[in-house]
Amino acid sequence: APTSSSTKKTQLQLEHLLLDLQMILNGINNYKNPKLTRMLTFKFYMPKKATELKHLQCLEEELKPLEEVLNLAQSKNFHLRPRDLISNINVIVLELKGSETTFMCEYADETATIVEFLNRWITFCQSIISTLT
């Protein structure tokens, strides 16, 4: 059974992931952002189901495409370079989902824009955090 300290650690990691995803969304989600039209041409794949930490495998698999899109963004919108930002997210995702269990991600048929993709994973983080508190 998870201890209160491990639950607290998980919660903090999820909050960190949530903040990173929100920062990316806020950085690009601007009607006046000239690069937004370019970013919206990229397709992202969404999980069929995302209710448990193991489903973060689906986010991990989309981090490389996410980095490619962020390379289009104006760097002033983010504190870190896309590569460093994605690297930080990857570390958190690996810790949260655990590397010892192999989970095959199932994707939905419908693809998503970067905005829809980020909103989906932000909702996921918020949902898991709410079950922990």
Partner: antibody, heavy 126, light 108 residues
Framework: QVQLVQSGAEVKKPGESLKISCKGS????????IGWVRQMPGKGLEWMGI????????RYSPSFQGQVTISADKSISTAYLQWSSLKASDTAMYYC???????????????????WGQGTTVTVSS | SYELTQPPSVSVSPGQTARITCSGD??????AYWYQQKSGQAPVLVIY???KRPSGIPERFSGSSSGTMATLTISGAQVEDEADYYC???????????FGGGTKVTVL
């Protein structure tokens, strides 16, 4: 309503220079990318390049890089396509088109180029 | 440079279904857009983001994408659908756009 009005038809000789225009109205000109598309007689559409009038960020198709210059004057809401030395092979219809981004709730949709000018016919002949 | 490949022509009888394909290496990660161009007119957007229809475009126009192939389908083709159709997408970097070669749809 949102409109792009292009300058009139041009007949030029090889080696001459030319600048055609595309005037936007009914929207914030500086907030949308404007692209240029070539259509040679009886042929398909070719993407030439694009400009963001807000900061003049410009991208060219590798096929047109160095062949034409795309610019904009935001004070008069006008985009331009120019040649320094025309060739007979530049004979074509040239369209300007605006890229459209729509905000719907917390989401954004990108419609590609969905507002088009009427086209400018350029004829280059000796 | 990046290319999108379309068949030069597609023929269909009125009321039948026409399918136009567009292939490109980047399409698994890039949305396709479709334009209709009637003779002597400027192009009109008929599909965006692979499968979404702008307002004012008839329901008989639909789009889909799978792997490196995007498809525009005209279900129950009508005489007024006779036109050239172009797919449009970006290269892998997202910086440069490209049109397919175009497909002439004839409704016989």
């Amino acid at each position: 309503q949102v409109q792009l009005v292009q300058s009139g038809a041009e007949v030029k000789k090889p080696g001459e220079s030319l600048k055609i225009s595309c005037k936007g109205s009914g929207y914030s000109f500086t907030s949308y990318w404007i692209g240029w598309v070539r259509q040679m007689p009886g042929k398909g559409l070719e993407w030439m390049g694009i400009i963001y009038p807000g900061d003049s960020d410009t991208r060219y198709s590798p096929s047109f890089q160095g062949q034409v210059t795309i610019s904009a004057d935001k004070s008069i809401s006008t985009a331009y396509l120019q040649w320094s030395s025309l060739k007979a092979s530049d004979t074509a219809m040239y369209y300007c088109a605006r890229e459209t981004l729509a905000a719907v709730g917390s989401n954004y949709y990108y419609y590609g180029m969905d507002v088009w000018g009427q086209g400018t016919t350029v004829t280059v002949s000796s | 440079s990046y290319e999108l490949t379309q068949p030069p022509s597609v023929s269909v009888s009125p009321g039948q279904t026409a399918r136009i394909t567009c292939s490109g290496d980047a399409l698994p990660r890039k949305y396709a857009y479709w334009y209709q161009q009637k003779s002597g007119q400027a192009p009109v957007l008929v599909i965006y983001e692979d499968s979404k229809r702008p307002s004012g475009i008839p329901e008989r126009f639909s789009g889909s994408s799978s792997g490196t192939m995007a498809t525009l389908t005209i279900s129950g083709a009508q005489v007024e659908d006779e036109a050239d159709y172009y797919c449009y997408s970006t290269d892998r970097s997202g910086n440069f756009w490209v049109f397919g070669g175009g497909t002439k749809v004839t409704v016989l």
